[in-house]
């Protein structure tokens, strides 16, 4: 009888471990989905708000090709900057090419001068790889020039005509980006 109870207890224990594992996997999946959901909402919000607006970019945004850019007038830490962009139906700037980098730095010179602006680039804590917010790697010519001495999480920012890195928990301006509305002519 005692052996039977012991076996049942072990089976229950095993079942509990499996459930805990499943719950952990589910939590990770949910977190990943929540982030993807945010991006989808940002994209949808952008599409819907653009549909009511004939200009390719909202007021106070700058257009270059198929992108609209917003240069903030407020300081935030990196994570809050990302949230601020999401509220506007956009994401932190993702620089795809040298041409785009040149446009951004040229525009910043005209607008504000030599300040720091967060972009959507962060360093993976485990591998040390730089990743854009969509999970892609920056092209070799668009890697931050200096490695931050910070032991904390490290994120990318633009200053003058350089891409640099800093502790994500410092305050900087930021740049948001979203798709420009195609004019339906």
């Amino acid at each position: 009888k005692l052996l039977q109870v012991s076996t049942i207890a072990m089976q229950q224990q095993e079942k509990l471990i499996q459930q805990e594992r499943a719950l952990l996997n589910f939590t990770e999946w949910k977190r990943s989905c929540a982030l993807q959901m945010k991006y989808c909402q940002a994209f949808m919000q952008n599409s819907l708000s653009s549909a009511h607006n004939s200009s390719p970019c909202p007021n106070n945004w700058i257009q270059n090709r198929e992108s609209c850019y917003y240069v903030s007038e407020i300081w935030s830490i990196w994570h809050t900057s990302q949230e601020n962009c999401l509220k506007e139906g956009s994401t932190l700037l993702q620089i795809e090419s040298k041409e785009e980098m040149d446009f951004i730095t040229g525009s910043l010179r005209k607008i504000k001068g030599s300040y720091d602006y967060w972009v959507g680039l962060s360093q993976d804590g485990h591998s040390g790889r730089w990743l854009w917010q969509d999970g892609s790697s920056p092209s070799p010519g668009l890697l931050p020039a200096e490695r931050s001495q910070s032991a904390n999480q490290v994120c990318g920012y633009v200053k003058s005509n350089s891409l640099l890195s800093s502790n994500c928990s410092t305050w900087k301006y930021f740049i948001c980006e979203k798709y420009a509305l195609r004019s339906s002519v």
């Epitope: 300081w75 994570h79 900057s81």
Partner: nanobody, 126 residues
Framework: QVQLQESGGGLVQAGGSLRLSCAAS????????MGWFRQAPGKERGLVAA????????YYADSVKGRFTIFRDNAENTVYLQMNSLKPEDTAVYYC???????????????????QGQGTQVTVSS
């Protein structure tokens, strides 16, 4: 758009005191948190002190605790930073800051976004 005008900076001997003032205009002052940032040459900008909309909650960087006091006068739309026992390492440009969105929260100043003034230079000589 909020406008912030700092005053009270200057040159002071180590051990001395200064009081920085910041007059805010452009919106309802009493519903927003206010703060002071500073940036020394070659250093990151950092939050020195912050105060909630009600004055019920304050934040101080470890390096200034016990020496600096932040307080606000909602009737006058002004926030102050009283700086005592100043040290050479307090030398920096000090920026007044206003919370970008009136969240009504008391704490957690770290994750807020801030409008900032033009800055006022504070130099502490030894």
């Amino acid at each position: 758009q909020v406008q912030l005008q700092e005053s009270g900076g200057g040159l002071v001997q180590a051990g001395g005191s200064l009081r920085l003032s910041c007059a805010a205009s452009g919106r309802t002052f009493s519903t927003y948190a206010m703060g002071w940032f500073r940036q020394a040459p070659g250093k990151e900008r950092g939050l020195v002190a912050a105060i909630s909309w009600s004055g019920g909650s304050t934040y101080y960087a470890d390096s200034v605790k016990g020496r600096f006091t932040i307080f606000r006068d909602n009737a006058e739309n002004t926030v102050y930073l009283q700086m005592n026992s100043l040290k050479p390492e307090d030398t920096a440009v000090y920026y007044c800051a206003a919370e970008a969105e009136g969240s009504g929260r008391e704490g957690n100043f770290y994750e807020r976004s801030w409008y900032q003034g033009q800055g006022t230079q504070v130099t502490v000589s030894s």
